[in-house]
């Protein structure tokens, strides 16, 4: 169970979805993607302190053990809980076509 949405750290420091603007060149996609020429990439960034947005019991245990054994047990990671699909117009051997990617953009985030 997700444990809490209260961030004990400075504002915006905890795990959340952030949008980063990236060109096709930034992403290394310029040789196979035609559009969009710039992508507003929504990604999960931030710390996972205490029991913040713990995805499940395993994440809660990980948080507790990380406090006890930080050298052995890493803190939970901020990762997508769900995704928004996105369409890319891409070059293929047979010509230009559409492809929808279901796991390209983070919709919301949790700690795991």
């Amino acid at each position: 169970a997700r444990n809490g949405d209260h961030c004990p750290l400075a504002a915006a420091a905890c795990c959340a979805a952030h949008t980063v603007r990236a060109s096709l060149e930034d992403l290394g996609w310029a040789d196979w993607v035609l559009s969009p020429r710039e992508v507003q990439v929504t990604m999960c960034i931030g710390a996972c302190p205490s029991q913040f947005r713990a995805a499940n019991m395993h994440a809660q245990i990980k948080t507790s053990l990380h406090r006890l054994k930080p050298d052995t047990v890493p803190a939970p990671c901020c990762v997508p809980a769900s995704y928004n699909p996105m369409v890319l117009i891409q070059k293929t051997d047979t010509g230009v076509s559409l492809q929808t990617y279901d796991d390209l953009l983070a919709k919301d985030c949790h700690c795991i």
């Epitope: 969009p36 996105m86 369409v87």
Partner: antibody
Framework: QVTLKESGPGILQPSQTLSLTCSFS??????????VGWIRQPSGKGLEWLAN???????YYNSALKSRLTLSKDTSNNQVFLKISSVDTADTATYFC??????????WGQGTLVTIS | QIVLTQSPAIMSASLGEEITLTCSAS?????MHWYQQKSGTSPKVLIY???NLASGVPSRFSGSGSGTFYSLTISSVEAEDAADYYC?????????FGGGTKLEIK
Amino acid sequence: QVTLKESGPGILQPSQTLSLTCSFSGFSLNTHGMGVGWIRQPSGKGLEWLANIWWNDDKYYNSALKSRLTLSKDTSNNQVFLKISSVDTADTATYFCAQVAWDWFAYWGQGTLVTIS
Amino acid sequence: QIVLTQSPAIMSASLGEEITLTCSASSSVRYMHWYQQKSGTSPKVLIYSTSNLASGVPSRFSGSGSGTFYSLTISSVEAEDAADYYCHQWSSYPWTFGGGTKLEIK
């Protein structure tokens, strides 16, 4: 497989409001970069872009017709609606809806003929 | 708005002939699409972003251009190429189409 189908009244009288529906399948308007566009074509003439509606509900209209156009969508039922108010005989045309991916009318409906008479 | 002017309005070509259709824009555009519309059907894309062949389009079609001048070339015309051809820009709203070129086969 992407399909789109336009439906409309067929015949309308001048000054009335034209209501068109685009029903589609094979894609979702929840997908970033996806939209539906409307294009019309008077018989024997060229294509005229009317409007686009996007996944994020952004709407863009042909400036020459903007005051008369209204776009909306029902994402859960895969439908897009276009209303054109105060029609006259110059609005007689075949009306197409098309799937727009970013900047490309990738798939088109078969069109529906609307006659203002 | 950006006005696209296509020429010629009507072109007659023989089987196997190489032809070029042109599209001139009233202001510079970054890219151009080309659509083909056969009689009684809806348009379909031939060329995406100036020079990229759409999936399933025969390789005898090609596109080029930049700025205000773009062209569509058919290297060896076939009977099935009889159609109307439209250029289309989306660099700025309102999106616009050219007036079209009707290709007739002799």
